[in-house]
């Protein structure tokens, strides 16, 4: 159980106040953490509290600001970056947010050492990704869909792709579906180690249908918003990976690197670009049905100016029991010697666990094991492999940092984190400088979130970046809820929950419950992390009890729990949130007639199901954007899970999961269904799907459509949704305003 | 050593068509992208179209888009240039060229194209 | 497009003598992209410099390329007599890739 912060004296109870749903609102108790904007091996830069940007160096103790905050101000700037000599930074303004990675801007660039912007061949604008060379101040950026390059920022720009075109051909950026689903970043360019190539991924969407939908806006007319979009089953992008020479690009132009044989034979995605060397870069790819990963390993020849793949040097990566990966599939971490590479794929337990590859799959050793996963390779050096796991303690919704000693044998492991600050922190990442001679530890609780630095031989701690005694000052008179994690073990099958209790709990009495669900493939909710959000208000405020419940298809606890969905999405899920409510019931705590459900996404999905279930649990529940039915929703995540929509594989599962198929078992309860009209990821046509389907057979329930906001429902719509979302519930709890 | 060999010059009337090969030796020909550059009787020399290695994108100056065509097999080391709706400005000697937009580091020794009636 | 401009039109020289083209262009051309040629009667050009500074293979040391920006030099240290020929400085930064009008190089 983890109290926070833990309350000693009663006297001090009566100064004390419960959250208000105001604090959430405004953000009252939001944390801060510090990731080093690192440089070197031992200097990083930060954008201090003024605006000032400033490099530290760890070694001599010193600091000096290399950029004012009056230079960031004369254009606005609310983002930047140095180029790797040091000679220019470029400054970003004007952002303007496309989907959940991309954004556009306008960017200038800054001459430091004469102090002044560079003037000519300024860049055009808006850009929609820009970038410094690792070396040099080389810069490549997209505009118009087509990739640029500057061998210096006052040089004229060389046009590397002419074939660019909205919504038709995307050229070092993401189309929409491989920016959310696959490679979950605004660009789709990678410069090699010392900046020789240029490595660009071109999609072609051409053939992909087009969900269109209305913005408003405040004109006459609403305009349409048009985003190629692969539903399940849908013709996909076509994609191709070129690698340019930026030193003489116009000589050769863009070589393209040849898609594995094994892969190229029907549909498949690029899932991922690593670059080992100058002149060795790492592929992968992945089948349309998403069981088989190809790693493919490619060497420049000098001789023929081309990149050559040898089968010899193609890994394949293949999953029996679901999907290939856990939510993505695993990147390679390459060693010193620029062939061999670690690797997280599932051993033969079904664990996720580093592995280390020198010629074959076949023939990888093991670095990791137990029933338990490795989470994250953060750096390999000589000596050392520094990864993230859940072993600690058998707690899967834990975080900490490990190192194992590779340059000796046999390899010995020691925790970094587990110890440190054993109550505050128990769910950590980690920021390497260069080489790894420093690194930050950034801890995100369950204690407040604490940021500190640490010398990368001896893992000492060095300084605190951030501690967040502000907010720890402001906390001092709240009544927060009380948090506890633990687990039901049930058919064999281990349920970890979180359950939020209000301050003053006591056991004797009832509460009513608010399962606030997630639920999605290779997810996890319940984690150790701090946090003050609306379920702490209702807990603090309103006395609700919240739980949070990790059932089968979430992550991080072996391929039994996680694969468990593949191929029955809406099945189980839904059976495990449903447990978990006959065991809170057990508990004797639970007051059975107020029982509620929330979900968004993914969650409203899972909510809007289990509140259909016909169980009588729910009195109501709330639906945030959910998916209504898996043919709505995006290819590749889709596929991957289910299979696609056709006869002879998955349709009939795809029409038995669907939300609309349960309407009739709506009557029982009081549902809320929320949907923003210019959602972009989860269509609003989902609930509009819904809505029909409960007219049809005449079931009454509550609905609310937010105009021209997207899946996150941001800006003064968040404020909206809370307020509304607290009423329905207080009212289906009955409890007063 | 890299050998390249126009053919398929003479002389054609105007608004005829005529098609251009260079045969490549030497080189890995499907990895390097190929040009047309010409010269006009007694004056300098003229980019008239690109084509990328696998031949999936080409490019053309503005005298010559929409009458031009730039292709290539690359299972035969061959780069081509069909040129229709031909005009008397069109008369020059042709050179295959090994390259992109530049620099051009083998050529090959022209074929002479003259538009006339 | 690029407009390259060369200059002299024609350079009058002995054998032996130092040979200063110029090449001037109407918008900043990154030195990466700047190459020269030269072309004898009846021959297809040959690479001489790329990079605006680069030798190509086989080009002897008498022959050099500086210059950035706009302005750019060829320099024939020392005229030797199968030097005379026509040079064409060439860009490759935008498309259309374009050439020089060209400096003819005649023995005096």
């Known amino acids: 159980i983890v109290l926070r912060p833990s309350r000693v004296h009663n006297s001090e109870e009566n100064t004390m106040r419960a959250l208000t749903l105001k604090d959430i609102l405004n953000g009252t108790f939001s944390y801060k953490t510090f990731f080093p904007n690192w440089i070197s091996g031992q200097e990083y830069l930060h954008q201090s509290a003024d605006n000032n940007i400033v490099l530290y160096n760890i070694e001599t103790g010193q600091s000096y600001t290399i950029l004012s905050n009056r230079t960031m101000k004369s254009v606005n700037a609310s983002n930047y970056g140095l180029s790797p000599d040091r000679q220019f930074v470029y400054l970003e303004s004007d952002y303007s947010k496309l989907w959940r990675y991309s954004y556009t801007a306008t960017y200038y660039i800054y001459d430091l050492s004469n102090g002044e912007f560079v003037r000519g061949n300024e860049l055009p604008r808006p850009i929609q990704y820009l970038c410094w060379s690792p070396v040099g101040s080389k810069l490549a950026y997209v505009y118009q869909n087509n990739i640029y390059l500057k061998q210096r920022p006052g040089d004229p720009p060389f046009q590397i792709t002419f074939n660019g075109r909205e919504n038709k051909i995307f050229n070092g950026i993401p189309d929409w579906v491989y920016e959310e689903e696959m490679l979950a970043t605004k660009y789709a360019l990678w410069w090699s180690p010392n900046g020789k190539f240029l490595a660009y991924a071109e999609f072609n969407d051409t053939d992909i249908p087009v969900i269109a939908y209305s913005y408003y806006g405040d004109e006459q007319y609403p305009r349409t918003i048009n985003i190629p979009y692969p539903k399940a089953g849908a013709k996909n992008p076509v994609v191709r990976i070129f690698i340019i020479d930026t030193t003489y690009p116009a000589y050769v132009g863009p070589q393209e690197v040849p898609v594995p044989a094994m892969i190229a034979s029907s549909d498949y995605y690029f899932s991922w670009l690593t670059w080992v060397t100058d002149e060795r870069v790492c592929l992968q790819w992945l089948k349309r049905v998403q069981n088989v990963s190809v790693l493919s390993i490619c060497d420049f020849r000098e001789d023929w100016q081309t990149w050559d793949c040898p089968k010899t040097q193609e890994h394949i990566e293949e999953s029996r029991t679901g999907w290939a990966g856990g939510f993505f599939v695993s990147t390679p971490v390459f060693s010193y010697d620029a062939i061999s590479y670690y690797k997280i794929f599932s051993d033969k337990d079904g664990y996720k666990h580093i592995h280390y590859i020198k010629d074959t799959v076949e023939n990888a050793i093991q670095i990791t094991s137990g029933k338990w996963e490795a989470i994250n390779i953060f750096r390999v050096t000589q000596d050392s492999l520094f990864y993230s796991s859940n072993e600690f303690e058998e707690y899967p919704g834990r975080r900490n940092i490990y190192r194992i000693s590779i340059g000796s044998y046999p390899p010995s492991k020691k925790c970094v984190t587990c110890h440190l600050r054993k109550e505050r922190c128990q769910y950590y990442t980690a920021s390497f400088s260069d080489y790894a001679k420093y690194y930050a530890l950034v801890c995100y609780g369950p204690g407040i979130p604490i940021s500190t630095l640490h010398d990368g031989r001896t893992d000492q701690e060095i300084k605190i970046l951030e501690e967040n005694k502000e907010l720890e000052n402001a906390l001092k008179n709240i009544q927060l809820p009380k948090e506890e994690i633990k687990k039901l073990e049930v058919d064999e099958i281990t349920l970890w929950y979180k359950m939020i209790l209000p301050p003053q709990f006591d056991r004797s009495k009832k509460y009513p419950l608010l399962i606030q669900v997630y639920g999605g493939p290779c997810s996890q909710s319940v984690r150790s992390v701090f946090a003050v959000n609306w379920i702490s208000y209702l807990a603090s405020k309103e006395g609700m009890v919240i739980a949070l419940v990790d059932g089968r298809g979430t992550a991080f606890q072996g391929d039994k729990l996680l694969y468990a969905v593949y191929r029955k999405l809406g099945v189980y899920e839904v059976e495990d949130q449903i447990t978990a409510v006959r065991k809170f019931i057990e508990m004797g705590f639970i007051d059975e007639k107020r029982i509620a459900i929330w979900g968004w996404s993914y969650g409203g999905y899972v909510s809007s199901l289990a509140l259909a279930s016909g169980t009588g649990l729910f009195k109501c529940g709330i639906a945030v954007a959910p998916v209504s039915s898996w043919e709505y929703y995006a290819s590749v995540y889709t596929e991957r899970f289910m299979g696609l929509p056709t006869k002879d594989d998955n349709l009939e599962h795809y029409k038995n999961s669907t939300v609309m198929a349960r309407a009739e078992y709506f009557r029982n309860v009081d549902y809320l269904l929320i949907h923003g009209t210019a959602d972009d990821n989860v269509h609003f046509q989902n609930s509009a799907q819904i809505a029909k389907a409960l007219v049809n057979a005449q079931v009454d329930f509550q609905a609310m459509w937010y105009s021209d906001q997207n899946h996150g429902l941001s800006g003064l719509s968040t404020n909206h949704l809370y307020t509304h979302m607290t009423h329905f519930l207080k009212q289906c709890f009955s409890l007063s305003d | 050593e890299v050998q390249l060999l126009e053919s398929g010059g003479g002389l054609v009337q105007p608004g005829g068509s005529l098609r251009l090969s260079c045969a490549a030796s030497?080189?890995?020909?499907?990895?390097?992208?190929m040009s047309w550059v010409r010269q006009a009787p007694g004056k300098g020399l003229e980019w008239v179209s690109a084509?990328?290695?696998?031949?999936?994108?080409?490019y053309y100056a503005d005298s010559v888009k929409g009458r031009f065509t730039i292709s290539r097999d690359n299972s035969k080391n061959t780069l081509y240039l069909q040129m229709n709706s031909l005009r008397a400005e069109d008369t020059a000697v042709y050179y295959c060229a090994k390259g992109w937009l530049g620099p051009f580091d083998y050529w090959g020794q022209g074929t002479l194209v003259t538009v006339s009636s | 497009e690029i407009v390259l401009t060369q200059s002299p039109g024609t350079l009058s020289l002995s054998p032996g003598e130092r040979a200063t083209l110029s090449c001037r262009a109407s918008?900043?051309?990154?030195?990466?992209?700047l190459a020269w040629y030269q072309q004898k009667p009846g021959q297809a050009p040959r690479l001489l410099i790329y990079g605006a500074s680069s030798r190509a293979t086989g080009i002897p040391d008498r022959f050099s390329g500086s210059g950035s920006g706009t302005d750019f030099t060829l320099t024939i240290s020392r005229l030797e007599p199968e030097d005379f020929a026509v040079y064409y400085c060439q860009q490759g930064l935008n498309i259309p890739s374009t050439f020089g009008q060209g400096t003819k190089v005649e023995i005096k």
């Open positions: 030497g080189f890995t020909f499907s990895s390097y992208a």
């Open positions: 918008q900043s051309v990154s030195s990466s992209y």
């Open positions: 084509i990328s290695g696998s031949g999936g994108s080409t």
